[in-house]
């Protein structure tokens, strides 16, 4: 099938990084500067993406692959292929329509992006709060309150060591 197709369509022989040039009797021509073709058999090359403004180049364009962009420091990528840059906030904040705002009491954000999330409710798992939450950190849940009742130890002491063949004194 491939041989039949190539006999019918000489363009199918053109590899990635080239295009089938109709102006030159359908011979394979290299993609011009600042353009690429990522698959064979292309009749045109695509224009390379330019990482401008708040975007910076993560990977240069080549004859066979498009450039890849990321965001300048203080911003992070959103969308497929980093189509938009969104401003970072500090840990303990979230981005609102009015800019970066501190997380409300009872919520936290340990990243520079995303929303403030509620602290874990330790009691739902029958546990107690070992370390309080902050704007930047979730609570740390510890053993259940029953395990910490007076006189009870949360750590079981190891059994006394016994030598083989000897009964305890």
């Amino acid at each position: 099938f491939e041989r039949t197709r190539s006999l019918q369509d000489p363009c199918s022989n053109c590899p990635a990084g080239t295009f089938c040039d109709n102006n030159r009797n359908q011979i394979c021509s290299p993609c011009p500067p600042n353009s690429f073709s990522s698959a064979g058999g292309q009749r045109t090359c695509d224009i390379c993406r330019q990482c401008k403004g708040v975007f910076r180049t993560r990977k240069e364009c080549s004859s066979t692959s498009n450039a890849e962009c990321d965001c300048t420091p203080g911003f992070h990528c959103l969308g497929a292929g980093c189509s938009m840059c969104e401003q970072d906030c500090k840990q303990g904040q979230e981005l609102t329509k009015k800019g970066c705002k501190d997380c409300c009491f009872g919520t936290f954000n340990d990243q520079k992006r995303g929303i403030c999330r509620p602290w874990t409710n330790c009691s739902l798992d029958g546990k107690s709060v070992l370390v309080n939450g902050t704007k930047e950190r979730d609570v740390v849940c510890g053993p259940s309150p029953a395990d910490l009742s007076p006189g009870a130890s949360s750590v079981t002491p190891p059994a006394p060591a016994r030598e083989p063949g000897h009964s305890p004194q």
């Epitope: 993406r49 403004g53 708040v54 911003f75 959103l78 189509s83 938009m84 401003q87 981005l95 800019g99």
Partner: nanobody, 122 residues
Framework: QVQLQESGGGLVQAGGSLRLSCAAS????????IGWFRQAPGKEREWVSC????????YYADSVKGRFTISRDNAKNTVYLRMNSLKPEDTAVYYC???????????????WGQGTQVTVSS
Amino acid sequence: QVQLQESGGGLVQAGGSLRLSCAASGFSLDYYAIGWFRQAPGKEREWVSCITASDSSAYYADSVKGRFTISRDNAKNTVYLRMNSLKPEDTAVYYCAAPRSDCFHYGENDYWGQGTQVTVSS
């Protein structure tokens, strides 16, 4: 032709002031937030300030808070960045940008100016 043009840059001594302008032509700034960025030699581009379209709310980077003031005059289709108490570390090319969405999101089709050089000598 749609474009943004910065002006007002120059050489100033530490402690001095400058007022940068960002003028739009070919479109109305009324409906756009305008952000200022700067890029020092060998450094990454850095966000400086932004003013919203809806209510002219102003936002600033911590490094310029209390020293820089952003304002807009929609009748003149221009946004200004007043820079007081300038420091040598403020030396950079300053760019204005008109994001299509808001002060906190920038995309590939936003309008950008060519930049104006600010040099602060000690």
